[in-house]
């Protein structure tokens, strides 16, 4: 068979699998006269032999790990042993078989990890080697955790990067590891060759001992700082510490205060920089941040709480420059005249703001001094000695000392002596009749004017009239405002009227004075009036309990799952029927009676989340009024979209023949949600048969480079299958095809004779 197993002397390359006993010749070289014999030199290793007649063969199994390429030379000799042709290079490439097991560099590894370390951040690497060809699956290693001890609640705290051997914490490990509970863990790690994919793979194991160290980056206890400190500032009040020295500390004032009286030094000590004033601000909450030397936060900020402790630095203050009270001239001893309420800005319910009252002067002292007394702690003024007479002294002025434990303040009180309250208010009408209103009458509307008169001294508490509704309005839907000059009462709507709960209300008003009546005088029927409020029905639409209902479900919930519910009530008490509007994707159905919402089709976050529909509540019977509310269904992502190419890559070409290995870059994407750092795709060739011609290498989480391994490509289109794995839970893989054409080029573009197939590649490499 000329060509495959025999032929003339020329440079040739042969590929032979290692480990196989010789079963056939490599090549039969044909001699061209005057050549009669052949000679073999080079890296024969006493394995390769050429017979004088030109038969090249090998006499025992090859070992790629000893020599992966044998560079031989064959020369043709004449009858005198003189080289007449060659020597020509003959290359024997030894192809790999999986005849070596992976071995860990260490039988035991030790490492430490800090509690609350960032998930996925490597803290230890295990490393194995395999003498087989790393460009083939035989030398491609796959690491996994066989067991974690102890295993608490079946939760893995550690994870390993299958390719690099990097060990890091899982999210659960980051949250739950605690050296106080479990200071050490042991992992058994396995490594397999064949990328872990074959039953025939070799493996090895190693042990990893992990110490969990305490995370000292913790919020300190709340600090109490006394206000108005006279000590030299700054004063250290607390501290934070990163787990290593050299962190760059800063404070963040979330409240954006005009003055922020705290600082932090490079050791993490926190200071108050100036005296604090509790009355200005009684507590501060701010954050301590630790950054690395590159300016990146090392961890979450810590919340610092500072409570400002009160000192007695505020005197009592009077409620007004002069406080005015009235007293009737025949009031009895002990009657209350009024209460002086002074204030103190110091902390409530402490000795610093606890006030004492004392009368220090009365003018005039007629008919005698000491006519009034004040309750020491309550500030209530009382008549102490006798009744007063308006014609003798119509007005008294008191000076009252108000004191806390350190300060004294003088307050001034004016007491006006007024006529006795011996006249009661009298309504001009005892019955204001019936009033009919629709239940939707506006709040704030005045619906009735009432009037009573009082013959006591004008513009005093004895003649002033206050109106109260004492019956018929337990819901407090109505109120009465009084005009202080005319004592006219205006009845207003304070809350919505409601036919359904109060169609008819029999309202009773009472007219009273703020001043007490003299002994023996009582309010009688003249001080009472009534009216009847009739509320007419307005048919109202059902009312939803919320404007927007929101629910959250995973996008992969089973059909028929309850995903939410809505509730509405009809003011008239009619039954309600629920329906959906705007369910454009046909994903949902609603139970007409209960308002429960169910999925009726597969949900898909990638089609849009939240999914917004309207829910309609309609009266059953009556005038069938309806209301509309929103239902927003937030779909939580599951990894249900395999990676794909980010764009159309038709038209990729290399100019043939290749002068050097070439490469092209492609981008992958998928439609799932990628929080924080974006996708983390891994790339590999889609089938083993591509390994000899192509290589794919990751650039970052979304981009990879496809490179040729050699330059010996035919002038045709190659379809390169690429496997893209998203590393999700569960991991999804997409197999995509990149069509790459090797073509003759004219001025850097593919040349196609006229009439050749369409679809000319347009992207040169």
């Amino acid at each position: 068979q000329e060509g495959k197993f025999s032929g003339p002397l020329k440079p040739m390359t042969f590929s032979i699998y290692e480990g196989q006993e010789p079963s056939q010749i490599i090549f039969q070289f044909k001699a061209n006269p005057p050549a009669v014999t052949f000679e073999l030199t080079g890296e024969t290793d006493n394995i390769f032999v050429i017979e004088r007649e030109g038969l090249l063969y090998y006499n025992r199994a090859l070992d790629r790990e000893t020599r992966s390429t044998h560079n031989l030379q064959v020369a043709a000799l004449d009858a005198n042993g003189i080289i007449v042709e060659g020597p020509v290079p003959i290359t024997i490439k030894v192809k790999d078989i999986n005849d070596n097991r992976p071995t860990f560099l260490q039988s035991k590894y030790e490492g430490s990890v800090r509690q609350n370390s960032r998930p996925g951040k490597p803290f230890l690497y295990v490393n194995a080697t395999d003498l087989d060809d790393p460009a083939t699956p035989n030398g491609q290693l796959y690491y996994q955790i066989v067991i974690q001890l102890p295993m608490i609640n079946n939760v893995m705290y550690f994870q390993i990067n299958n390719k690099t051997g990097a060990i890091s914490l899982t999210r659960e490990g980051s949250q739950e590891l605690n050296p106080a509970k479990n200071p050490s863990y042991n992992l058994v790690i396995s490594v397999k060759d064949m990328g872990g994919q074959s039953e025939n793979s070799f493996s090895d194991t190693t042990s990893v001992d992990i110490i969990v160290t305490e995370n000292i980056w913790k919020a300190p206890k709340p600090v109490e700082m006394v206000e108005n400190s006279t000590d030299p500032h700054p004063i250290k009040i607390t501290q934070v510490r990163w787990n290593d020295p050299g962190a760059q500390y800063s404070l963040v004032d979330k409240e954006k205060l005009p003055r922020f009286p705290f600082s932090i030094d490079q050791e993490g000590d926190i200071y108050v920089t100036q005296p604090l004033d509790r009355e200005e601000k009684d507590a501060y909450v701010f954050y301590a941040v630790a950054k690395d030397e590159y300016g990146k936060p090392l961890s979450y900020p810590l919340e610092i709480h500072v409570k400002v402790k009160d000192i007695n630095d505020n005197p009592p203050t009077c409620p007004s420059p002069v406080t005015v009270f009235e007293v009737q001239e025949n009031e009895r001893l002990g009657n209350s005249i009024g209460t002086l309420t002074a204030h103190d800005r110091d902390e409530e319910n402490t000795a610093n703001s606890f006030l004492n009252y004392r009368i220090v002067e009365q003018t005039p002292k007629l008919p005698m001094d000491g006519l009034f007394l004040i309750q020491t702690y309550a500030g209530m003024l009382q008549l102490a000695k006798q009744s007063l007479k308006k014609q003798d002294t119509p007005q008294y002025n008191l000076t009252i000392e108000v004191s806390d434990k350190d300060f004294k303040t003088l307050c001034f009180v004016q007491i006006n002596v007024i006529d006795i309250n011996d006249q009661i208010p009298i309504f001009e009408k005892s019955d204001y009749g019936n009033l009919t209103l629709a239940e939707d009458t506006n709040i704030g509307s005045t619906i009735l004017t009432i009037q009573a008169t009082d013959a006591d001294e004008p513009f005093t508490g004895s003649s002033k009239i206050l109106y109260h509704i004492i019956k018929g309005d337990s819901e407090g839907r109505l109120g009465v405002d009084t005009d202080p000059h005319t004592n006219t009462g205006y009845v207003i709507i304070k809350k919505p009227l409601d036919f359904e709960t109060a169609a008819v209300s029999n309202i009773v008003f009472k007219a009273e004075n703020p001043e007490p009546l003299v002994f023996g005088v009582k309010y009688n029927a003249s001080s009472f009036a009534k009216f009847t409020l009739i509320v007419t029905d307005v048919n109202e639409a059902p009312q939803f309990s919320q404007h927007v209902f929101q629910a959250k479900v995973s996008e992969d919930v089973a059909i028929g799952t309850k995903v939410g519910n809505v509730t509405a009530k009809d003011p008239e008490g009619l039954d309600i029927s629920y329906s959906l509007r705007g369910d454009t994707r046909g994903w949902l159905k609603i139970d007409h009676v209960t308002g429960e919402i169910f999925s009726v089709a597969p949900l898909d976050r990638e089609a849009g989340s939240p999914y917004r529909v309207q829910v309609v509540a309609t009266e059953v019977g009556g005038s069938s009024l309806s209301s509309v509310s929103e239902f927003h269904l937030i779909l939580m992502d599951v990894n249900d979209n395999p990676p794909r190419l980010a764009k159309d890559y038709t038209g990729l070409f290399f100019c043939h023949p290749l002068s050097a290995p070439g490469s092209l870059i492609f981008e992958a994407t998928d439609d799932d949600q990628h929080l924080f750092r974006g996708p983390h795709f891994t790339f590999s060739l889609g089938s083993g048969s591509l390994q000899n011609d192509w290589e794919v290498s990751k650039i970052n989480g979304t981009h990879a480079r496809l490179s040729t391994r050699h330059t010996e490509f035919e002038e045709r289109e190659y379809v390169v299958l690429i496997r893209i794995n998203d590393g999700g839970r569960p991991p999804l893989e997409g197999i995509v095809s990149l069509p790459v054409t090797f073509c003759s080029c004219v001025e850097g573009s593919c040349f196609r004779p006229a009439g050749h197939q369409t679809g000319i590649p347009t992207v040169g490499m």
């Epitope: 690497y125 000292i216 787990n243 290593d244 020295p245 050299g246 690395d292 030397e293 590159y294 990146k296």
Partner: antibody, heavy 119, light 112 residues
């Protein structure tokens, strides 16, 4: 095995700039920070600065802030240091060295790049 | 900045002898929050780049012979070679990594 392969020696004129490279292999480039150290002939070591390859954040010795600029190219696992406005004082061997994130020593060093500044 | 001082600047010993070299820092390198000392020792043989010998003041790196011992606390540190071999001819540098990084001036070890 971890390797830090630095670019070759440089002979430059005063006032020139130079960019030396350090190609990392045998480990995950973004899992370690890369630092640069100067050693003048017969002298001790001086820390110049470091860079976080993940996002390019830098940290400099104040002495070198106006002299050196550190950058990385994640796609080629290579760190660079550019030295500007060169004088004879800048003649030295410059080393790159990796440090795990945090406060750790320099566990692997490049072979060094000799920079000679001469008119 | 933390300043590191080494002494002596050079010393000459015979093979088999014990040698100690000193390193002082201008401030304590002990971080009280975790009780770690942020000091390393490096060996630089002629024509080579520095090699990490000891971290955390006393932890030998893997592959470093046990004749090398680091000790000290706070501000005063010592590197001891219990029985010098010819291959130990090198410059030895201490370095703090407590805040940024600074090296000592070095100690040149020569063999008689």
């Amino acid at each position: 095995a971890v390797q830090l392969q630095q670019s070759g020696p440089e002979l430059l004129k005063p006032g020139a700039s130079v960019k030396i490279s350090c190609k990392a292999s045998g480990y995950t480039f973004t899992d370690y920070t890369m630092h640069w150290v100067k050693q003048s002939h017969g002298k001790s070591l001086e820390w110049i600065g470091g860079i976080n390859p993940n996002y390019g954040g830098t940290s400099y010795n104040e002495t070198f802030k106006d002299k050196a600029t550190l950058t990385v190219d994640k796609s080629s696992n290579t760190a660079y240091m550019e030295l500007r406005s060169l004088t004879s004082e800048d003649s030295a061997v410059y080393y790159c060295a990796r440090i795990p994130y945090g406060s750790y020593p320099m566990d692997y060093w490049g072979q060094g790049t000799s920079v000679t500044v001469s008119s | 900045d933390i300043v590191m001082s080494q002494s002596p600047s050079s010393l000459t010993v015979s093979v088999g002898e014990k040698v100690t070299m000193s390193c002082k820092s201008s401030q304590s390198l002990l971080y009280s929050s975790n009780q770690k000392i942020y000091l390393a020792w490096y060996q630089q043989k002629p024509g080579q780049s520095p090699k990490l010998l000891i971290s955390w003041a006393s932890t030998r790196e893997s592959g470093v012979p046990d004749r090398f011992t680091g000790s000290g606390s706070g501000t005063d540190f010592t590197l001891t070679i219990s029985s010098v071999k010819a291959e130990d001819l090198a410059d030895y540098y201490c370095q703090q990594y407590y805040r940024y990084r600074t090296f000592g001036g070095g100690t040149k070890l020569e063999i008689k």
